[in-house]
Interface confidence: medium
């Protein structure tokens, strides 16, 4: 179920998978709700602790069996990822961290008038994932409305740092806010070139793509088809950046399926979830559980309903059946992604719908003349 | 869509162009895709063209002027008119098609979610209506997939400028008071949408207006929210079991 | 019916520049990768630049690279090509050609243009 | 690049004859191997795609064989109309035609 209440001075001991820097606890969370393992976060703001480097520390946590034992903490701000909780699901973060510094790369200065405006320029900027701005009374004059754009390699900053006249906070993109507009386009046989960020297995592009989407320093990918003559390389999908924001060179090349992050489409982003069900496939990777269940859409809502099911395969062969139910097979990996796909297989598989903003706990989303 | 612009692909993934073929093809009126096997669309779309078999429905088009005889679409297993509609009345502007076949969702081609039933406390202030229809009162039929983003109107405000017409609880309406933007013949039947709490629902269906854009009489569309009941009722008795986006 | 018609071609001096139309026809012009292929006289096939369907993508031979620039008019269903920098070695029938994509799997050049002749000569 | 090589360049013979061209890519190019038909002063007509497949309205005595980098053409029988100019052509990674073999009338 969807657990959103925050605890208060209390933080989660062990179960650590992942940490960093974050301005506040709803980002934090955030952060928490788009990884693939956080089940539980812990969150330490910069008045809660002395240590200068845990200062804004944000912790994402998982555990086999949901919870953590809580230890007070003077001021650390605990809580819940947001999987399983239909439309509170988003990666938008509109807050502007007002004495606030987030380092990061920075590769962009230029003045301007307000923090909105160094906002939209982040928004509006292919490579930004976070901003900090000097205002008009910063203590050094030669600084004073300065709009330093910033990245970093995980798109969280490298550090947080309690400076007075700066203000600070992320990109509007995940808000559908970027003036930049998205390719659509889906470009069959082309392979893109430039940096691998990280390759992942998915069964089709459109998966592939929406992983670009929503991976921090993604902002295009191509994918090697089932049929893709090494075998060793089928399906996956290898997410790409490059300086300029767009491949430097795309090669002709059969069996390949290229294609852009939609994180900069204006208005609409694509749900940061996956409901395709993929006939005569099998996800492999670590198992969670096994069940007896009728149907492959059951499997799939077995596998939404167990908040650390990532994927799922619903076997279909005589020796996993038992008259009507057949064996579900719920699975999960470090990434979230299946750690091999094979074809040919007795069954089907799919994603957990965890992250699907029209989930369980979402309402979804003449005469005088006729029309 | 009077005042609109273009669409691009994936905007709307709902919307659909239901066309009827009989000595040449022409689209009609919109829909909203809502299920693998389901659209909602308004009843007067049927008037005098009840015949399932004359109806071709295109999902995950932008640009009519690409539907070409090789175009997949969809026919009709089913078509459900609201059992209270009178061909006379504006009331009860609300039918569900049956399709032949379960479409498969693609990012171009996706069902919009159901509000709640009887929504009526949740406060909406961006509304879009989207459609292939004409661009003003004497216009034409358009190719590329309109949007305009319009806001509600109250029901109170909606009365005052319909004096001759009973705007029932069962109605929503959007315009401008200096009027400009509208839908327009060909639209109707297509979603009235508005984006709550970063989620996309089918506020209403397209379904009557005086002329289009007009100053100060806005456009009356089937309020969805109030006949969840019907399409709950009408999708599950259908096959068993509720193919569509439903609310919690 | 399905058509290609070419145009633009003719003689011009080495140095020189030429545009080459293509107007499509009988299909769905936007939804295919189109290509530009040359036969110089007496000799065979060679592909010269394909542009994607979008017109966001483009791809030439290393003969023609820096030199030629592929591009589309989705809303007039034509296809250019821009020749500069034109050689001797240019001359040729240029065709043009699309390359149908999807299930069942088509992705050779299937439908072909009658061809315009382009002189390059001095 | 990958490089297409025909063989034989040219060919003689008379109606009736069973007729095999083979071409050699310089690397796999899986079964991304398309034919032509080329008759002078005309555009080129595809036969056969996917290395086997024939294409709609080809004659059946047409077939493609072949995958990997060895690919033939074979003319079961040959007819008046078959006497033109053929070509294969890669669409692995970009695109490349072999040099094209001349079948002329013995």
């Known amino acids: 179920g969807c657990l959103t209440q925050l605890y208060e001075n209390a933080f989660f001991r062990g179960g650590d998978v992942a940490s960093m820097y974050t301005p506040n606890a709803q980002y934090c969370q955030m952060r928490c709700t788009f990884h693939p393992r956080c089940l539980l976060f812990s969150f330490l703001p910069a008045s809660s602790i002395n240590d200068m480097e845990k200062r804004f520390g944000c912790f994402l946590k998982d555990s086999v069996t949901g919870t953590l034992p809580k230890v007070h903490r003077t001021g650390a701000v605990s809580g819940h990822s947001l999987k399983q909780c239909g439309h509170q699901i988003s990666a938008c973060h509109r807050d502007i961290y007002k004495g606030v510094d987030m380092r990061g790369v920075n590769f962009n200065v230029s003045k301007v008038s307000s923090v909105e405006e160094c906002q939209k320029r982040c928004t509006s900027n292919i490579r930004c994932q976070f901003f900090s701005y000097a205002t008009q009374t910063f203590h050094k004059a030669e600084y004073r409305n300065n709009c330093l754009l910033k990245y970093s390699p995980g798109g969280t900053p490298t550090a947080i740092k309690v400076l007075s006249n700066v203000e600070s906070g992320f990109s509007l993109k995940p808000c559908a806010l970027s003036e930049i507009g998205c390719h659509m386009n889906i470009f069959q046989h082309l392979a893109f070139s430039d940096v691998d960020v990280a390759r992942v297995l998915t069964p089709d592009a459109f998966v592939c793509r929406t992983i670009c989407t929503y991976h921090p320093n993604c902002l295009f990918f191509t994918f090697y088809t089932n049929v893709w003559k090494i075998e060793s390389q089928r399906n996956v999908c290898l997410l790409k950046t490059s300086e300029s924001g767009t491949p430097s060179s795309s090669t002709p090349q059969e069996n390949t399926i290229s294609g852009y992050s939609l994180l900069t489409c204006k208005r609409t982003l694509p749900e940061p979830c996956h409901s395709k069900i993929y006939p005569g496939v099998d996800f492999g990777g670590e198992e969670l559980n096994v069940t007896f269940v009728k149907g492959v859409n059951v499997c799939q809502e077995t596998c939404t309903k167990m908040i650390r099911c990532q994927f799922f395969t619903y076997s279909l062969l005589p020796e996993d059946c038992k008259e009507e139910k057949c064996k579900c097979f719920l699975r999960l990996s470090m990434d979230g992604s299946p750690t091999r796909i094979a074809y040919g297989t007795q069954g089907s598989s799919g994603y957990s719908l965890r992250l699907c903003n029209t989930g369980d706990n979402s309402v979804c989303t003449t005469k005088t003349s006729t029309r | 869509i009077v005042g609109g612009t273009n669409s691009s692909w994936g905007e709307w993934p709902w919307q659909v162009s239901l066309q009827v073929k009989l000595t040449a093809q022409r689209h009609l009126c919109g829909g909203s895709l809502i299920g693998h096997q389901w659209v909602l669309t308004a009843a007067h779309c049927f008037d005098g063209l009840p015949l399932q078999d004359v109806w071709r429905i295109y999902s995950g088009i932008l640009n009519l002027s690409d539907i070409t005889k090789d175009t997949p679409f969809s026919q009709i297993k089913e078509i459900i008119i609201h059992q209270n509609y009178k061909v006379s009345e504006g009331n009860h502007d609300i039918a569900l098609i049956k399709l032949q076949a379960p479409l498969n969702y693609t990012e171009f081609q996706k069902p919009i979610c159901l509000p709640s039933k009887g929504d009526t406390s949740t406060i909406y202030t961006n509304c879009w209506v989207t459609g292939w229809g004409f661009s003003k009162e004497k216009g034409e039929i358009q190719n590329i997939l309109q949007k305009v983003n319009i806001p509600l109107v109250t029901n109170e405000e909606c009365q005052k400028r319909y004096q001759d017409y009973k705007i029932t609880q069962r109605m929503v309406c959007a315009g401008y008071k200096e009027g400009g933007k509208d839908a327009c013949k060909g639209d109707s039947g297509g979603p009235l949408v508005c984006k709550h709490n970063g989620m996309w629902r089918l506020v209403g269906i397209t379904s009557w207006g005086e002329g289009c854009a007009r100053r100060e009489q806005p456009g009356v569309y089937t309020k969805v929210a109030e006949y969840m009941d019907w399409i709950l009722e009408k999708t599950q008795s259908s096959d068993g079991k509720a193919q569509m986006q439903s609310p919690a | 019916e399905v058509q290609l018609l070419e145009s633009g071609g003719g003689l011009v001096q080495p140095g020189g520049s030429l545009r080459l139309s293509c107007a499509a026809s009988?299909?769905?012009?936007?939804?295919?990768?189109m290509m530009w292929v040359r036969q110089a006289p007496g000799k065979g096939l060679e592909w010269v630049s394909g542009?994607?369907?979008?017109?966001?993508?483009?791809v030439y031979a290393d003969s023609v690279k820096g030199r030629f620039t592929i591009s589309r008019d989705n809303s007039k269903n034509t296809l250019y090509l821009q020749m500069n920098s034109l050689r001797a070695e240019d001359t040729a029938v240029y065709y043009c050609?699309?390359?149908?994509?999807?299930?069942?799997?088509?992705?050779?050049?299937?439908?072909w243009g009658q061809g315009t002749m382009v002189t390059v000569s001095s | 690049d990958i490089q297409m090589t025909q063989s034989p360049s040219t060919l003689s013979a008379s109606v009736g004859d069973r007729v095999t061209i083979t071409c050699r890519a310089s690397?796999?190019?899986?079964?991304?191997l398309a034919w032509y038909q080329q008759k002078p002063g005309k555009a080129p007509n595809l036969l056969i795609y996917k290395a086997s497949t024939l294409e709609s309205g080809v004659p059946s005595r047409f077939s493609g064989s072949g995958s990997g980098t060895e690919f033939t053409l074979t003319i079961s029988s040959l007819q008046p109309d078959d006497f033109a100019t053929y070509y294969c052509q890669q669409y692995n990674t970009y695109w490349t035609f072999g040099q094209g073999t001349k079948v002329e009338i013995k």
């Open positions: 690397q796999s190019i899986s079964s991304w």
């Open positions: 542009i994607y369907s979008s017109g966001g993508i483009t």
């Open positions: 050609a699309y390359r149908r994509t999807g299930v069942p799997r088509r992705d050779s050049f299937d439908i």
């Open positions: 009988g299909f769905t012009f936007s939804h295919y990768i």
